[in-house]
């Protein structure tokens, strides 16, 4: 019989229900925005905005200062007071729409839904390792702003993204706002604009450059700005918007908008469609050819990548990559594939595609039918013509006008659909050693820290834990402070170590010591932990073998048994070759001699499952007693593996030595031709791994084996005669003298 060790699911080596408590702060209301500051002199702060209030926290998440930002018209509103005596507009709550740092000053800028979306500038005042906010400056000049032209109206109640860029001595605010007809009619915010902060902090310079959704499209064409960032020579906005101005407005797709970070102008404003798909390895019948589209971006983050992912993406280590979490639609409801997919877009490739698109539009002769696009911002036109014009005048350049690149940038899910039902709501990517880690928040209030790799059919978790008991969604915006990430969920801010919250979710020594170096995991006798959790017994260099099962569970006291041991950390080498003298197995007092691994039986084990097998030949000593005993595996002097060496002993109870007894055999005669069905009755007849019924030295073919009974078919006899019949278990004869009589057929 060929017994095989049962597979242990990979998931059995970890427990994602382990509770981790990370530092947190209760903000007293739904967190609307959050940003962190790290100064040159070790001072740092976390700024957390809720409705009508702005909290300043120290690096330990303890409250340092709190500022009332609303309601507008309320005498207690501290920011409103900075604008002088009112009224400044209709009263109402202030929901923070923008919270950014101006690194040049340094200062914090907050903009809310009240007071025409104006902003306030708070200079940062370091006090030891903490930071305080100076009295706010109102970034609004009443005489400069009109309902139809308002350089100081920044935030839209429908959402605004801001990236601040230093150019020379000035700070430029790259602003993208969602609009509708009602918002557009009220102090005219723009869709995309670049505004220079005035040196006297009295607001933004007039005459700023801007693009806005044309009035005729405002009702049906809404743009959601999901993320903005600055890298290299450009500022990028990521949007979700209708795929067409003319078609169904609910058919959405994702675009990247690129603006120059060195020139505060919009002539070189470019857009590119980002296409993220789930392409399963085995395509279902009826599934779309290029994979299932996930057109709607939920969250995004850009970061330099580690060596392994860089190789997989065919780029250089440390190059900036834009990562996006995409869903199938606005509701992100379940489709055929996973709920969320993650696509990676190398920034250099994005830039190349955009630049190629510009060349295609502006070359001579131009490909016929190429459109400039962006018909929601500008009059329709064909390349190379400027918007709304039939031809290019000699002194204007085709390049100096906004353009939608005609080709899209297509990528497939990095996780191959393995996020499954998880709905990702927050994303931050970091590079740790040469590993790229995605830190993801989920709809049900969990944090997933997963290595970003393409080539696997399982997820490599750093951690997967619940932030708290509320189960509220983790919010989109994540901030970094030192070696921690700050996630918001409901009314709380949580501080999660980039290296993971701990190691207790790794249940086995092998899984523990295979964890990434940056996690700092070590084995503490019977649990995985960081050194500070168990300084006494903590070590990172070896694991004992672990016996989980063996077969058979009993063997004869006389005769040999082929014993198969199951478990982990037997070899550390896929070949399973055992150096001489390293593995010692004892069953009770008896040694079990290691058997060479049968290479024909070697089966590839998928990484999702793991099990190791070890076989040995058990020959009980003469002193061995009948009855239950332990199986013990000791491994010593093993050469070290990639992560650790195997060293130690594992003991498992449950083996029994038994003495088979043969009580009766019937019938005691049969035809010389053979084929008589013999029944042998007794006790412990099924022990061990081998047994044989011999009729005159020839094997009687076993048909059934049980503890109390053996059935076999007699072989043909040479002559009519009485011949000896015997039973061997494990190669040793069971006591008793029996004969079988061959008769004429």
């Amino acid at each position: 019989e060929d017994w095989q060790c049962p597979r242990t699911p990979y998931a059995a080596s970890r427990d994602f229900d382990v509770k981790y408590v990370v530092p947190s702060f209760s903000a007293g209301g739904l967190v609307q925005a959050m940003v962190t500051y790290e100064g040159d002199r070790n001072e740092s702060a976390v700024f957390v905005a809720i409705r009508n209030r702005l909290h300043v926290l120290g690096p330990d998440l303890k409250s340092v200062q709190s500022l009332a930002t609303g309601p507008a018209g309320d005498p207690g509103c501290q920011t409103c007071a900075a604008c002088g005596p009112g009224p400044h507009g209709p009263p109402g709550d202030t929901d923070t729409k923008v919270l950014v740092l101006d690194p040049a000053l340094p200062a914090l800028v907050s903009c809310g839904s009240s007071l025409q979306g104006r902003c306030f500038l708070h200079d940062l005042e370091p006090q030891g390792t903490a930071v305080h906010l100076a009295a706010p400056a109102c970034l609004f000049s009443a005489h400069h702003n009109r309902p139809d032209d308002c350089p100081d109206c920044v935030a839209s109640p429908l959402g605004t993204r801001v990236t601040v860029v230093e150019q020379g001595q000035a700070s430029y605010f790259y602003v993208a706002s969602s609009l509708d007809a009602a918002v557009a009619a009220s102090f005219s915010p723009r869709s995309v604009s670049i505004r220079r902060l005035k040196a006297d902090a009295s607001g933004f310079a007039p005459g700023f450059v801007a693009l806005s959704v044309l009035p005729k499209h405002l009702v049906s064409y809404s743009i959601e700005y999901v993320h903005s960032f600055h890298t290299g020579a450009f500022v990028y906005f990521l949007t979700v918007q209708p795929a067409s101005v003319t078609d169904d407005p609910s058919a959405l797709h994702t675009r990247l908008a690129r603006l120059s970070a060195t020139e505060p102008e919009l002539g070189d404003y470019r857009e590119l469609v980002l296409d993220c798909r789930f392409a399963p390895k085995r395509r279902r019948r009826g599934a779309p050819e290029g994979g299932q589209p996930y057109p709607v971006l939920r969250v995004a983050h850009s970061a330099p990548v580690g060596a392994q992912l860089a190789t997989e993406l065919s780029i250089a280590e440390g190059q900036e990559v834009l990562f996006g979490v995409f869903v199938t639609g606005k509701d992100g409801g379940p489709g055929v594939g996973p709920n969320s997919v993650v696509c990676a877009f190398p920034i250099d490739l994005l830039d190349t595609l955009i630049d190629e698109g510009v060349e295609r539009c502006c070359e001579s002769p131009v490909h016929p039918g190429l459109r400039r696009g962006l018909d929601f911002f500008q009059s329709p036109s064909f390349c190379p013509n400027p918007p709304g014009l039939e031809a290019l005048s000699p002194n204007t350049s085709c390049r100096h006008f906004p353009l939608l690149v005609s080709s899209s940038f297509s990528r497939v899910d990095l996780f191959n659909g393995l996020l499954g039902p998880v709905q990702v709501t927050a994303l931050y990517v970091t590079r740790l050693d040469n590993v790229t880690v995605a830190h993801m928040g989920t709809m049900d209030g969990r944090i997933l820290q997963v290595e970003l790799v393409r080539s696997l059919n399982y997820l490599l978790y750093v951690s997967n834990f619940s932030l708290g008991d509320s189960g509220q969604p983790v919010q989109r915006d994540v901030s970094r402070l030192g070696d921690h990430l700050l996630f918001a969920s409901g009314d709380q801010v949580f501080q999660v170590p980039i290296q993971g919250p701990g190691c207790r979710h790794f249940l086995t020594c092998g899984r523990c010591l295979r964890a990434w170096h940056f996690m700092g995991c070590g084995w503490c006798g019977n649990m995985c932990g960081q050194q500070k959790e168990c300084p006494g017994s903590w070590q990172q260099d070896h694991c004992p073998p672990k016996l989980t099962e063996f077969h058979p569970h009993s063997g004869p006291l006389r005769g040999s048994t082929r014993l198969t041991l199951c478990g982990s950390n037997f070899y550390l080498h896929p070949s399973g070759l055992v150096p001489e003298g390293t593995h010692q197995v004892t069953v009770g007092q008896s040694p079990c001699r290691p058997l060479p691994k049968d290479s024909s039986k070697l089966r590839p084990v998928p990484r999702k499952d793991f099990v190791e097998e070890f076989e040995c030949e058990l020959e009980p000593l003469g002193t061995q007693a009948v009855g239950p005993t332990n199986v013990s595996l000791t491994v010593t002097n093993m050469p070290p593996g990639k992560h650790f060496r195997v060293d130690g002993t594992s003991v498992l109870r449950g083996f029994s030595f038994m003495e088979p007894v043969l009580i009766a055999v019937q019938p005691l005669f049969g035809p010389r031709a053979g084929g008589t069905c013999l029944t042998l009755e007794g006790q412990s007849l099924s022990v061990g791994t081998s047994r044989a019924v011999l009729v005159n030295g020839t094997e009687c073919l076993l048909a059934r084996v049980s503890e109390g009974q053996l059935l076999c078919a007699t072989p043909p006899g040479a002559t009519v005669a009485s011949v000896p019949l015997s039973l061997q278990v494990g190669g040793a004869q069971v006591p008793g003298s029996w004969t079988f009589q061959y008769r004429e057929d």
Partner: antibody, heavy 116, light 107 residues
Framework: EVQLLESGGGLVQPGGSLRLSCAAS????????MGWVRQAPGKGLEWVSS????????YYADSVKGRFTISRDNSKNTLYLQMNSLRAEDTAVYYC?????????WGQGTLVTVSS | DIQMTQSPSSVSASVGDRVTITCRAS??????LAWYQQKPGKAPKLLIY???SLQSGVPSRFSGSGSGTDFTLTISSLQPEDFATYYC?????????FGQGTKVEIK
């Protein structure tokens, strides 16, 4: 009239260097991508290199990568091809041409002969 | 790299004949294809771009068709000045690659 005029070709020994120039006139040079295409005697056309309008991005054929450098001076309306470590198989007429996707117009070409 | 294969490598024809030259790309290039004419000792001249668009100043007897991987240049009625070598070139991606050329000779 749009015109391109190459110069700088000649006889050079293997391992030697040569710099080709292409003077452009009749159009706004700084608005266009430019490139070099070569043709070995009795053979077909082979694209060599292209450069963006600003000079900010360049492309090369594998056969010349690391040996040839394309550049431009928009103030002088001139395109250049610096050729180092020349080999016998680089012998060809080198044309400068305007364009990104397709090439139009072309210069009259300059002959580069690599021989010992 | 995208390989461009032209056929035939040469064709003998008379004035007034209809001549067809084909070009096959090793992978799809949409309509990013150009055709050039080159006469001995002269620089190439752009005839067709975007697979089927006639460059200004080129006689209408030249036409191009095709999309994806298979393209055709047709001269509807061969004129004496049309005896030359014709090249296709893909513009879908870098490196730009040319076909090996088709020589149109007098019969």
């Amino acid at each position: 009239e749009v015109q391109l005029l190459e110069s700088g070709g000649g006889l050079v020994q293997p391992g030697g260097s040569l710099r080709l120039s292409c003077a452009a006139s009749g159009f706004t040079f700084s608005n266009y991508m430019m490139g070099w295409v070569r043709q070995a005697p009795g053979k077909g056309l082979e694209w060599v290199s292209s450069i963006y309008f600003s000079g900010g991005k360049t492309y090369y054929a594998d056969s010349v990568k690391g040996r040839f450098t394309i550049s431009r001076d928009n103030s002088k309306n001139t395109l250049y091809l610096q050729m180092n470590s020349l080999r016998a198989e680089d012998t060809a007429v080198y044309y400068c041409a305007r364009g990104y996707s397709w090439f139009d117009p072309w210069g009259q070409g300059t002959l580069v002969t690599v021989s010992s | 790299d995208i390989q461009m294969t032209q056929s035939p490598s040469s064709v003998s024809a008379s004035v007034g004949d209809r001549v067809t030259i084909t070009c096959r790309a090793s992978q799809g290039i949409s309509s990013w294809l150009a055709w050039y004419q080159q006469k001995p000792g002269k620089a190439p001249k752009l005839l067709i771009y975007a697979a089927s668009s006639l460059q200004s100043g080129v006689p209408s007897r030249f036409s191009g068709s095709g999309s994806g991987t298979d393209f055709t240049l047709t001269i509807s009625s061969l004129q004496p000045e049309d005896f030359a070598t014709y090249y296709c070139q893909q513009a879908n991606s870098f490196p730009r690659t040319f076909g090996q050329g088709t020589k149109v000779e007098i019969k």
